[in-house]
Interface confidence: medium
């Protein structure tokens, strides 16, 4: 429904606090290098303007679109050209091209300093001195580092962040109370950002149809008692929400997400029996809870799929009448029966079914042609099952750190051109699939593992897109969204790769490694491992293990030494020489 003033409409719907927070997130996700104070100033100006429109919707400029208002505001930043270079050219364009231009300049890996956590007392003082600024700064820092973070969900994280400080800054042992909560928020936040990044990549690179197919499969698994019409309605609404958020339309996105949560809770009876607790919560918690809700029980006595999708004489007639609806019904029916399959597997099955119907419905005897279509599914189902079984066995044998190292070696050999920090980050995340999913029973392993791997491989794809260096990565990332994981799994050692020149500096370490956290120390060692493989891609597992064991012993020895720096200098030279000899460099 049309409103005279869109900005007034959203301000009234969302309330001042959420309005300001969402505008801050939007601006920080667009202008990722701007100082905090500049963004706060812009947000305050927009908020004051919105209030004038609430008072009088016919006031000057109140009828302008949000993109026009926000774009005009962003283009007032004085240092745009110096700070952002060619992004400043966006300001010469008209809407909607200007907004598209801003979107294209979002940087998944902005050159920003790592967030260092201050001492607990320092944080508590800052929180008590100015709670509002403290929380705004949190939104700003997360949003600029994660330009596709799901904005309404970031409001939920900020609410939990505030609750943690409110509780723990009064506790007897502030650090013991606060630090685990902040660690949890950090880890959940990274996971949430990566999941949303995949949704946006799906919409932006593969289109609305791909996203809708994903949503049909996931919602059908989650709500197997809901009928197809209901699932279709939810998919349409969810697609609108994510299209808006991925497109920078954060006010509309948050508003529509709230409406969707309201609809779901008002229609629980026809959706899922698992929603009751979620629907008793306040808005932000409610939306989060619904998004994470467990799968409902499957209805008893679901009939065989073959009747409607293989045996029926109307298969080609129904397919011809409305291809996407019929395929949607197939996906819905298959997914609600298979909570044990990953979403990407379900989408591969639907694609196979579609390809078969395209071919067979044009054949002389369609039924004879598609009669065995379900037999084609068997190898598609067995491939991820076997892969997960093998990798979970390896994980249980090695533990997380060594499992990550095995993946580091595997992926560096597949795509050695990729930057070392990206290979380390992606392989560490791939390795986390073990502790995340292998503990689950068989029926939950595949949806956990393969859908998580899709999220992690998307990180590789978006980071690689910024600076493309490998045709193999480009191919796996762009050919098929649902076949990305099988594509990467199928890659063998890159025989065309010319080994990197040996550089002793890469393997020179200093006493500062001793003061690092266990995680940071692991990253240092894993960085060295990637560099070793890039120098000697044909090195055997045994050779690499020997060098890494020597390296671990060297670090442990020198960190115990009285003169650490001298130890690192002298023993380091010996280690480099021994490693070169061991690897035949």
């Amino acid at each position: 429904d049309a409103h005279k003033s869109e900005v007034a409409h959203r301000f009234k719907d969302l309330g001042e606090e959420n309005f300001k927070a969402l505008v801050l997130i939007a601006f920080a996700q667009y202008l990722q290098q701007c100082p905090f104070e500049d963004h706060v100033k812009l947000v305050n100006e927009v908020t004051e303007f919105a209030k004038t429109c609430v008072a009088d919707e016919s006031a000057e400029n109140c009828d302008k679109s949000l993109h026009t208002l926000f774009g005009d505001k962003l283009c007032t930043v004085a240092t745009l050209r110096e700070t952002y270079g060619e992004m400043a050219d966006c300001c010469a364009k008209q809407e909607p091209e200007r907004n598209e231009c801003f979107l294209q300049h979002k940087d998944d890996n902005p050159n920003l300093p790592r967030l260092v956590r201050p001492e607990v007392d320092v944080m508590c003082t800052a929180f008590h001195d100015n709670e509002e600024t403290f929380l705004k700064k949190y939104l700003y820092e997360i949003a600029r580092r994660h330009p596709y973070f799901y904005a309404p969900e970031l409001l939920f994280f900020a609410k939990r962040y505030k609750a943690a400080f409110t509780e723990c800054c009064q506790a007897a042992d502030k650090a013991a109370c606060l630090l685990p909560k902040l660690d949890e928020l950090r880890d959940e936040g990274k996971a949430s950002s990566a999941k949303q990044r995949l949704k946006c990549a799906s919409l932006q690179k593969f289109g609305e149809r791909a996203f809708k197919a994903w949503a049909v499969a996931r919602l059908s698994q989650r709500f197997p008692k809901a009928e197809f019409a209901e699932v279709s309605k939810l998919v349409t609404d969810l697609t609108k929400v994510h299209t808006e958020c991925c497109h920078g339309d954060l006010l509309e996105c948050a508003d529509d997400r709230a409406d969707l949560a309201k609809y779901i809770c008002e229609n629980q009876d026809s959706i899922s029996s698992k929603l009751k607790e979620c629907c008793e919560k306040p808005l932000l918690e409610k939306s989060h809870c619904i998004a994470e809700v467990e799968n409902d029980e499957m209805p008893a006595d679901l009939p065989s799929l073959a009747a409607d999708f293989v045996e029926s004489k109307d298969v080609c007639k129904n397919y011809a009448e409305a291809k996407d609806v019929f395929l949607g019904m197939f996906l819905y029916e298959y997914a609600r029966r298979h909570p044990d399959y990953s979403v990407v597997l379900l989408l591969r099955l639907a694609k196979t079914y579609e390809t078969t119907l395209e071919k067979c419905c044009a054949a002389a005897d369609p039924h004879e042609c598609y009669a065995k279509v379900f037999d084609e599914f068997k190898p598609l189902v067995e491939e991820p099952q076997n892969l997960i079984k093998q990798n979970c066995e390896l994980f249980e044998q090695l533990g997380e750190y060594k499992f990550q190292n095995a993946l580091l070696v595997r992926y560096t050999k597949k795509v050695p051109q990729v930057s070392t920090p990206t290979l380390v980050e992606v392989s560490r995340n791939l390795g986390k699939v073990g502790s995340k999913c292998c503990k689950h029973p068989e029926a939950k392993r595949m949806p956990c593992a393969e859908d998580y791997l899709s999220v992690v491989l998307n990180q590789l794809c978006v980071l690689h897109e910024k600076t493309p260096v490998s045709d193999r990565v480009t191919k796996c990332c762009t050919e098929s969204l649902v076949n990305r994981r099988p594509c990467f799994s199928a890659l063998e050692v890159d025989e065309t790769y010319v080994p990197k020149e040996f550089n002793a500096e890469t393997f020179t370490f200093h006493a500062d490694i001793c003061t690092l956290s266990e995680k940071e120390r692991q990253i240092k060692k894993q960085t060295a491992l990637v560099e070793l493989v890039k120098h000697k891609p044909k090195a055997t597992k045994e050779q690499l293990k020997a060098v890494m064991d020597d390296f671990a012993a060297f670090v442990e020895k020198c960190c115990k030494a009285d003169d650490k720096e001298t130890c690192f200098a002298e023993e380091g030279k010996k280690l480099v020489a021994a490693s070169q000899a061991a690897l035949g460099l």
């Epitope: 309605k233 009448e321 409305a322």
Partner: nanobody, 126 residues
């Protein structure tokens, strides 16, 4: 707004046939998911048959499959239900329902249909 008006009900012997009509106004019927429901005395509304908007994918309740046929005539903006081999348990008030804005998809759930006709009574008795 969609207005729906059913007709064609009446008394028929077991094994007989009837054809119900539902005339729609206010919106083109082919853009709307439409369905027939029925309500027997003292029972809830029960889905009988449905047809998607924009496409002719049809749906039937198991109890009427092979006996009833749903169709529509877009030029007349009318929905039909051809009922053959009628049984006493088919006795009910038959309602026509429309669900615009979600074309292609019909639903077996009465609460998802915002627009309803006033109903036409079908009695199957010897």
């Amino acid at each position: 707004e969609v207005q729906l008006l059913e007709s064609g009900g009446g008394l028929v012997q077991p094994g007989g046939s009837l054809r119900l009509s539902c005339a729609a106004s206010g919106r083109y019927i082919d853009e709307t998911a439409v369905a027939w429901f029925r309500q027997a005395p003292g029972k809830g509304r029960e889905f009988v048959a449905g047809i998607g908007g924009g496409v002719d994918i049809t749906y039937y309740a198991d109890s009427v499959k092979g006996r009833f046929t749903i169709s529509r005539d877009n030029s007349k903006n009318t929905l039909y239900l051809q009922m053959n081999s009628l049984r006493p348990e088919d006795t009910a008030v038959y309602y026509c329902a429309a669900r615009p804005g979600r074309p292609l998809i019909t639903s077996k759930q009465a609460s998802l249909y915002p627009y309803w006709g006033q109903g036409t009574l079908v009695t199957v008795s010897s």
